[in-house]
């Protein structure tokens, strides 16, 4: 099943996807597509990278993070209701059937006419810079700058933990983004 992310009409949506390059600058091709990941590539490609650079993109879709460090999270600018749906992030790791694929579900909500002031933001639209975890002994806090190197399995595990409603209550709004896939 897909991980769900949310954004409001008119906002930018953020769909996280990561990998750890084997060595700095040793990149692998990545594609983003609208629709669930098929057997090969991405259907309806909106953005693509090779080992050096972004080599294909369409308007409103871009990589805001440092893709040279493996942050291939997709930003969709000024979303509309039509942007709702499944997106595929495919990390085309060389070798036989090595590529990693992630299906992410984007839910677009109508814009609020009069947004009520609130300290808490929908954590699936924008993760804060600081994440406090609990439920596993003493609370520990990690800033973005001190996050350890993590592999795809750890990313997936962390994403699952973030979806836990207990953790959602600990997310504080500081206007930055934890980039996890």
């Amino acid at each position: 099943s897909e991980v769900e992310y949310r954004a409001e009409v008119g906002q930018n949506a953020y769909l996280p996807c990561f990998y750890t390059p084997a060595a700095p600058g040793n990149l692998v091709p990545v594609c983003w597509g609208k629709g669930a990941c098929p057997v090969f590539e991405c259907g309806n490609v909106v953005l693509r990278t090779d080992e050096r650079d972004v080599n294909y993109w369409t308007s409103r879709y871009w990589l805001n993070g440092d893709f040279r460090k493996g942050d291939v999270s997709l930003t969709i600018e000024n979303v509309t209701l039509a942007d709702s749906g499944i997106y595929c992030c495919r990390i085309q790791i060389p070798g036989i059937m090595n590529d990693e694929k992630f299906n992410l579900k984007l839910v677009i909500k109508p814009a609020k006419v009069t947004p009520a002031p609130t300290r808490q933001r929908d954590f699936t639209a924008a993760f804060p810079r600081m994440l406090t975890t609990r439920g596993h002994g003493p609370a520990e806090t990690q800033t973005l700058g001190s996050l350890p190197d993590i592999n795809l399995t750890q990313i997936s595990t962390l994403a699952n933990e973030l979806r836990d409603s207990r953790l959602a209550n600990d997310l504080r709004d500081s206007g930055a983004t934890i980039r996890i896939g």
């Epitope: 692998v28 091709p29 594609c31 629709g35 669930a36 098929p38 057997v39 090969f40 590539e41 991405c42 259907g43 309806n44 490609v45 693509r48 090779d50 080992e51 050096r52 080599n55 294909y56 085309q92 790791i93 060389p94 070798g95 036989i96 059937m97 090595n98 590529d99």
Partner: antibody, heavy 125, light 108 residues
Framework: EVQLVESGGGLVRPGGSLKLSCVVS????????MHWVPQAPEKGLDWIAY?????????????YYADTVKGRFTISRDNAKNTLFLQMTSLRSEDTAMYYC?????????????WGQGTSVTVSS | QIVLTQSPAIMSASPGKKVTLTCSAS???????LYWYQQKPGSSPKLWIY???NLASGVPARFSGSGSGTSYSLTISSMEAEDAASYFC?????????FGGGTKLEIK
């Protein structure tokens, strides 16, 4: 004009080997994934191998095989020569078919949009 | 793997008649990744319909495609002699990609 031209087919004994080639023109070969699809006489189509494009070097491709050819067939590409290969070993009579190469168009139609004319492989003693 | 079953295996139709070919999947297929190919004797396959309902370049408007889940179809609104060929469906939603066994369409 997009063109794909296969070669290398022929008659081979069971257990033997063949190397098929597919030379392409009319598009930027390195940008596109490529497939091999055999068609047994009077039968349907049967996908067997895929190699991804979008890589600068030929060695950094993602590869997929059908279970029926895993360990026996090897797909590869030489981007500098605009050529796709299929190395076939331990050939069996059931490998007898017309072998087509096909382009995987991720930009527009997202699948096997152009096919070669095929090269015939017969495995028989 | 997903098995695609095409029916009928062989059919003949008179010019001007409506023709419907079906492709049934053993489990659900994303409509984005269900394709149809046309093949004439001695020729290689040609992409005919992509993503269930989109006609490939040069395909006459009398052709259409529809379906979802496990049931897909290709329809010719008015059969013409040049439509006589074999038609294969393909899914590449799930590994491995699979083709249907084909329908051979003949002109009466």
């Amino acid at each position: 004009e997009v063109q794909l031209v296969e070669s290398g087919g022929g008659l081979v004994r069971p257990g033997g080997s063949l190397k098929l080639s597919c030379v392409v023109s009319g598009f930027t070969f390195s940008d596109y994934g490529m497939h091999w699809v055999p068609q047994a006489p009077e039968k349907g189509l049967d996908w067997i191998a895929y190699i991804s494009g979008g890589s600068i070097s030929s060695g950094s491709s993602t590869i997929y095989y059908a279970d029926t050819v895993k360990g026996r067939f090897t797909i590869s590409r030489d981007n500098a020569k605009n050529t796709l290969f299929l190395q076939m070993t331990s050939l069996r009579s059931e490998d007898t078919a017309m072998y087509y190469c096909a382009r995987h168009d991720w930009r527009g139609l997202y699948a096997m949009d152009y096919w070669g004319q095929g090269t015939s492989v017969t495995v028989s003693s | 793997q997903i098995v695609l079953t095409q029916s009928p295996a062989i059919m003949s139709a008179s010019p001007g008649k409506k023709v419907t070919l079906t492709c049934s999947a053993s489990s659900s297929v994303s409509s984005s990744y269900l394709y149809w190919y046309q093949q004439k004797p001695g020729s290689s396959p040609k992409l005919w319909i992509y993503s269930t309902s989109n006609l490939a370049s040069g395909v006459p408007a009398r052709f259409s495609g529809s379906g979802s889940g496990t049931s897909y179809s290709l329809t010719i609104s008015s059969m013409e002699a040049e439509d006589a060929a074999s038609y294969f469906c393909l899914q590449w939603s799930s590994y491995p990609p699979t083709f249907g066994g084909g329908t051979k369409l003949e002109i009466k």
